[in-house]
């Protein structure tokens, strides 16, 4: 049996990472031991799973790495890799400084809003997560059909504005659809804008007929699929 140890300490010499906002950061703590150790990450001393981070994080345990894409000022801090097995534990601290960049178009978290399947009569939430230097505003749009067509003569889609909101940077914006019907099915777009420009992402809502209670004991209100 052997306590954890760093296998490539020369790759960990760069303790301070100062990167421009929008860049990708990768921290690695390659280690070994017997039994094979596990790795956990802390941010400023607290367990870090990235759930509150736009874009989330990528943990690649086989590479002993933490990857954060499109870093923002709120990502600044001390990142600790904690490697442990039954025999012992080791840790290493990285310091991340995010250099603020010029204001840019809003960045929307990938995969949001998410394609969603729901049953008639259920409630649906579509999420949109925005990062913007300048204060963003959001619109929720539904793509509609007019005279049998989804597009006008100019080639642009017909849309209906469902909701407009001004939000704080890095806030989650939610579109609530209550008691959905077949007519609610279709394409929904989250539009985020600031003084630099607009960004859009879309998702599809599929609405299934009401399930027969004799066949289904309990159906979830909504299923989220990527």
């Amino acid at each position: 049996q052997q306590a954890p140890y760093w296998t490539h300490p020369q790759r960990m010499e760069k303790k301070l990472h100062a990167v421009p906002a929008g860049n990708t950061v990768k921290f690695r703590c390659p280690a070994a031991g017997n039994p094979t150790p596990t790795i956990r990450w802390l941010k400023d001393g607290q367990a870090f799973h990235g759930e509150n981070r736009i874009g989330g994080i990528r943990l690649r345990h086989q590479h002993w790495s933490l990857v954060m894409e499109s870093v923002v000022p709120s990502d600044r801090g001390t990142y600790t890799c904690l490697v442990e097995n039954a025999v012992g534990s080791i840790r290493y601290n990285y310091l991340l400084d995010v250099l603020e960049r010029s204001p840019h178009r809003p960045i929307l978290q990938a995969g949001l809003p998410a394609n969603t399947t729901a049953v008639v009569g259920s409630d649906v939430e579509l999420l949109c997560k925005v990062y913007s230097d300048a204060q963003p505003h959001i619109q929720w749009l539904k793509h509609i059909v007019i005279n049998g067509s989804s597009f006008g003569a100019d080639g642009f889609p017909y849309v209906q504005v469902l909701k407009t909101a001004d939000i704080n940077s890095s806030e989650v914006e939610v579109l609530y659809l209550r008691n959905v019907s077949a007519e609610d099915a279709g394409e929904y777009t989250c539009l985020a804008g600031n003084s630099i420009g607009l960004s859009y992402q879309s998702a599809w809502l599929t609405v299934l007929p009401e399930e027969d209670p004799t066949w289904t004991a309990a159906a979830p209100e909504a299923r989220y699929t990527d």
Epitope: R101, P103, L108, A134, Q135, Q139, V159, G193, N194, S195
Partner: antibody, heavy 124, light 112 residues
């Protein structure tokens, strides 16, 4: 017809001030960010500043930061550029440009409509 | 700041012949929403710039279909399939992804 009309240009000595205005018509001015772009004689285009639709956000090129102030009066459909401590290198045609709208737009989200420009000459 | 580098500086074209202008950005202009925010303008003598192409390849309303934009991430091209006398002017590319918005140095197109 969508239109932007700049005014206020002229000849001024280095160190002095000048205020440019841009009158907007033919669109809902209060729903659009607005920019100033300049072009020195015989040279290329240089972005100067932007202001959000409600005036809450303003950004400037490093070359004018601390000297120029962008502002707007949505009740009068007017965009302004207050230029202080003018330098010889500020000599240029100043264009007012429509930026991104507050909501869904068909086509480009801004930088589609330019004014005719107003000439500013800084010379001793 | 994002640097936009345009080539060539000038171009002399026979009417009816094609013309091509290149533009390179110092950083990718492909945004998280999947769009590439490069715009192309032409500036004719004594006039403000006029928008030709937006978001890499979309022709602005009223722009003849002999103009086309293409490219990806950092390398962009404006093509005129058959140059006409009215196409004389200075052509600029612009990045519209972050402030400060930046322009290429311009390409002067003249007729032989």
């Amino acid at each position: 017809e969508v239109q932007l009309l700049e005014s206020g240009g002229g000849v001024v000595q280095p160190g002095r001030s000048l205020r440019l205005s841009c009158a907007a018509s033919g669109f809902t001015f209060s729903s659009y960010a607005m920019h100033w772009v300049r072009q020195a004689p015989g040279k290329g285009l240089e972005w100067v500043a932007v202001i959000s639709y409600d005036g809450s956000n303003k950004y400037y090129a490093d070359s004018v930061k601390g000297r120029f102030t962008i502002s707007r009066d949505n009740s009068k459909n007017t965009l302004s550029l207050q230029m202080n401590s003018l330098r010889v290198e500020d000599t240029a045609i100043y264009y007012c440009v429509r930026g991104a709208g507050r909501g869904y737009t068909y086509g480009p989200d801004g930088f589609d409509i330019w004014g005719q420009g107003t000439m500013v000459t800084v010379s001793s | 700041d994002i640097v936009m580098t345009q080539t060539p500086l000038s171009l002399s074209v026979t009417p009816g012949q094609p013309a091509s202008i290149s533009c390179t950005s110092s950083r990718s202009l492909l945004h998280s929403d999947g769009k590439t925010y490069v715009y192309w303008y032409v500036q004719k003598s004594g006039q403000p710039p006029q928008l030709l192409i937006y978001e890499l390849s979309n022709r602005f309303s009223g722009v003849p279909d002999r103009f086309s934009g293409s490219g990806s991430r950092t390398d962009f091209t404006l093509k005129i399939s058959r140059v006409e006398a009215e196409d004389v002017g200075v052509y600029y590319c612009m990045q519209y992804i972050e402030a400060p918005l930046t322009f290429g140095g311009g390409t002067k197109v003249e007729i032989k």
